[in-house]
Structures are given as C-alpha cells and as structure tokens.
C-alpha cells in the first residue's frame, strides 16, 4: 500500500484546510490509527490529532475545537483531518503516520501555506496645485501573505514608486503615484489595483485628483460697444473664469462705488436701464484658496444724440 | 515550576477499587494531556493510558481497558485514576505524566497502591 | 504494538569509561522529521527523569555526556564519561502510535 496525500494544501485565512492522508491499499489490509502532528517546530513536533479504528477522533489539547474529520461517509482507510478556520499561525508543515495491518506503518509530510488576503488601503498626498513640481498624488498600501502586488490604473500621466516591508509571517507593499499637477487632471479617477492568490479579483481603490487652480479672468458683455447706450435695458457684465475649488465673484467700480440700481448676482453684474451714471470702470474679483484674478474693463454708456463711437478698453490683470 | 503532586499510598482489599490523585500546578491544566504510568515491583514501565484535561477524552492501553478509568477535575486542576476490581497483579507504583510534545518531561512522584487480603 | 528490546538488561561500567545501551524496536518510529523515541533514567525510589526526547535531543538540565543516536529501529545512549551519579536504570519510550511502550529498561552499576 501507499499513502496519498497533497505536498501543498493552499488555504485563505478563515477558511478549513482539508490535510489528506489517505491510505491506498491492498483488499484486506486495514488501518487502525493515523496520527497527525506539526513537524517544523525546532522544539519538537506538536500533535493536532490521532484518529483510531476503534476509539475515534482524538484532538490534541492545542488543538481543542479545530480538528474534525470530513463529513461522513467516511473511508475508513481515509486519515484525512479538517483543520478549522485556519490562521497565519497554521501555515507550516504536517505529517500523518499511518499505522496498518499487517502492512505496518507509513508516513506522509504535507506543507499548509495560509493565503492572508490584502485590506488594502489608499492615502492621498498632499493638496494638489497647479504649477507644483513632480508631487505625490497617492500611496496605497496592501498587506497580506504571500505579498501582494500593487498597481495603479489611471489616464493621468505619472511616475510609479514600490516599496516593500517583510514581517514575519506577511509582507506590507506600498506603492507611490507621483505627478506634477495640471488642471486637465481634475476629477479623474486614480485606481490603486491589489492583485493577491488569496483574492478572487483584484481589489481597486479609486481616488478622484482634485487639482487646486484658477484661471485667468475676463469679463463678456461688453463685445458690441454700441449696444451700450442710454435707455437699454438688461444690460450686464458676466465674469468668466474657472477654478478648483470653485471660486467666488465679487465686484467693484474702480473710480466710485457701485451705482444705485446696479445688481449683483456672482458673475454677473445687471444694470437698470442704462445712463450715462453707468459709465465707468468696472473690476471683477475672482479668488478661491489656492489664488485670485482681476480683469477690468470700462463701460462708456452712448447717448444715441451723439454720432461718434467711443474706444472701449479692456485690460486683463492678474 | 511546573509541579505534580499524587496522593499517598494506599493499601487496598482485593476485589476492591482505588481512585489516585494527581494535582497539577505551575502550568495551565488544559493544554496537556495527562498520562498514567504503572510500574510494578521491580518491573519496567508500562503505559495505562492519557485524558485530555480539556474535555476528558480518554484514550487507553487495551490492556487496561476496564481496569482503569481516567478522569479530570478542571476547576481543581486534579487528574485521577481509579482502578478497579484489584488483584495482586495490580499492587504496583502508578505515576501521572505530562506529555510535552509527544515526550513525558514532567512526572508526579508515583503512588505505591498494595492490594492485600 | 511496537516493542522495545532494550540491551543488555544490566552493565557495569568504570568510572570515567563509555556505558552504552541499545533499543531496538520492532518497526521504523521514524519519519523525514522525527523520531519519536525517548530515553529516561530512573534512580531508586524516583520518577523517571526525562533525559533525551526525538532519539537525540538532549532535556535541558541534563549534561553533555548523555548522547542519544539512531533513526528507524536502532537507537543507541551513550553516557561518556560515566559518573557515580548515573547509577541507575534506563528506559527508550516510543510514541509513535497508541499505546505507547517502553523497553525492559537497562541497569547501570558504576564499578
């Protein structure tokens, strides 16, 4: 007869790792006790259980409520054992010793290797600015046994940096994206993907870039200069920028205060119907965290009486 | 200091029954299995068979299926053995022994039990 | 159930000589990791006292001139230099499977 066994038995943390040891043998012979102990232990081997013929399953006191046999119907020539709800601390080798008749005894070695899956987990850098040098976007970090790999899936271009931690039984990888911050990067997703044997599919971690900006200020309205005459109404002023975080709006007239009737609604700035009180130089403010922008331009109110244009400045101010 | 101290001797009629203690001290009782040990007068060593203090799972020396019967007592950290229907042969030195890793490393100081009419 | 036949049943020995005492067993108690086999030495009076465990491994406590050898059936301890001390009688225990055995045991007298 022989023993047929597995030389790895792969489990995932918290799952029963099945050791087999099953006796193959000729018509007759039978099996009366199949011990079962860890063997890489320097200080000796560490019985789990022994299963005898006649008396049962007998789990060894370390070993209390985590050694069953298979679920019936069971081969008695069928050593095999079920180790419950394995962990790291299992992950090791196994022997069973098989005591027959009349053939005598037999032994097999086993190696139980414990898949940790990765709890993987993504940390941002720091705030993202447009103008900044090559930054770091985000790390990730997975750890688990054997060690996982970290990668990243993202449109945006970039720079990636591995690094790895051994511990005793894991090992903790870390993997750097870096990227030198443009307004085009953001609200695009960052995706850190941990790919493990211990994981049916990969894990993915998405992080949304949000890059820090403001755009250059302008002000729209004022394109046809002869529609600005005394008596029109719904005229207005509209400020046009763009930033991350969104920005705010504010208004002024450089050469007084705001004229009675005049109303402001963010970006936009409405006149009553005009006069030649209107005319002026007006100052749109733009501004969020990361900066601000002012354009300016001025408004010459016609009198229709008059037949000569006037020229309309724009100036842009940063 | 791992320690196990069995009762006295005892002197018994044949025929009759006698139940040896073992105390336990100096290590946590449920994670060994215990051990009986018989050693009669000039003889060698024999082995009676082991419980599991845990749960009280008993595996025995088919020979002395019947003669002996293992038990513990968790909460007093004591393993007892009481042997039944004694005769002659059964007059002898009984040692308790902790298996540590399949060797017996730790050993009470036996207890001499004499059966005589 | 495997037996143990221990040799010779006794031996005398000088004083600063080599005892060496034999244990056959009547089939392999070894695997490709260990060997489950012991020795213990008993003095008059006293428990037996764990002296080697897994066929050469010694206890600690117990001095460097206790040597155990051997794999498979044949297993031998060696006491070199023997000492007044190391009368006594000593046992090879298997437990390889239940029940577990001991040999017949060797008595060792200190000329």
């Known amino acids: 007869g022989e023993l047929e066994t597995s030389d790895v038995v792969t489990v995932v943390l918290g799952q029963d790792a099945k050791l087999p040891c099953f006796y193959r043998g000729d018509s007759g012979e039978q099996v009366g006790q199949v011990a079962w102990a860890r063997v890489d232990a320097g200080e000796g081997a560490q019985e789990l259980a022994l299963l005898h013929s006649k008396y049962g399953l007998h789990v060894s006191p370390a070993y209390e409520g985590r050694v069953e046999q298979p679920p019936p119907p069971r081969n008695p020539l069928d050593g095999s054992v079920l180790l419950r709800n394995a962990v790291q601390a299992d992950e090791g080798e196994y022997e069973c010793r098989v005591s027959t008749f009349p053939a005598g005894s037999f032994q097999a070695r086993l190696r139980l290797r414990v898949l940790v899956p990765p709890l993987p987990s993504l940390n941002p850098g720091p705030a993202l600015e447009e103008g900044q040098g090559l930054t770091l976007a985000a790390s990730c970090t997975a750890e688990g046994s054997p060690a996982p790999s970290v990668t990243w899936d993202t449109e945006v271009k970039g720079t990636t940096s591995s690094r790895s931690f051994k511990h005793s039984r894991s090992a903790a990888v870390t993997s750097e994206f870096h990227l030198v911050p443009s307004r085009s990067m953001n609200g695009q997703p960052l995706t850190c993907v941990v790919s493990h044997p211990g994981l049916l599919q990969d894990q993915r971690i998405t992080h949304i870039l949000h890059v820090s900006f403001l755009a250059e200020a302008s002000v729209r309205g004022l394109e046809d200069q002869n529609l600005w005459h005394i008596g029109r109404e719904g005229a207005m002023l509209k400020c046009l920028s763009e930033g991350q975080p969104p920005p705010s709006y504010n208004w002024t007239r450089l050469d007084g205060p705001l004229p009675s009737g005049v109303r402001v609604d963010g970006d936009t700035l409405g006149f009553p119907p005009l006069t030649t009180e209107h005319s002026g130089i007006y100052v749109c403010h733009v501004s969020n965290e990361f900066s601000s922008r002012d354009s300016q331009v001025t408004v010459d109110v016609l009198d229709p009486q008059e037949d000569s244009g006037k020229q309309v400045d724009l100036v842009s101010a940063s | 200091e791992v320690q196990l101290q069995q009762s006295g001797p005892d002197l018994v009629k044949p025929g009759a029954s006698v139940k040896i203690s073992c105390k336990a001290s100096g290590y946590s009782f449920t994670d060994y299995y215990m051990h009986w040990v018989k050693q009669s007068r000039g003889k060698g060593l024999e082995w009676i068979g082991r419980?599991?203090?845990?749960?009280?799972?008993?595996l025995y020396n088919q020979k002395f299926r019947g003669k002996a019967i293992l038990t513990v007592d968790k909460s007093s950290s004591t393993a007892y053995m009481e042997l039944r229907s004694l005769t002659s042969d059964d007059s002898a030195v009984y040692y308790c022994?902790?298996?540590?890793?399949?060797?017996?490393?730790?050993w009470g100081q036996g207890t001499l039990v004499t059966v005589s009419a | 159930d495997i037996v143990l036949t221990q040799s010779p049943a006794s031996l005398a020995v000088s004083l600063g000589q080599r005892a060496t005492i034999s244990c056959r067993a009547s089939q392999s108690v070894s695997t490709s990791s260990y060997t489950y086999m012991h020795w213990y030495q008993q003095k008059p009076g006293q428990p037996p006292k764990l002296l080697i465990k897994y066929a050469s491994n010694l206890e600690s406590g117990v001095p460097a001139r206790f040597i155990g050898s051997g794999s498979g059936t044949d297993f031998t301890l060696n006491i070199h230099p023997v000492e007044e001390e190391d009368t006594a009688t000593y046992y090879c225990q298997h437990t390889w499977e239940i029940p577990y055995t001991f040999g017949g045991g060797t008595k060792l007298e200190i000329k």
């Open positions: 022994a902790r298996e540590d890793r399949y060797a017996f490393a730790y």
């Open positions: 419980v599991n203090p845990n749960n009280g799972n008993t």
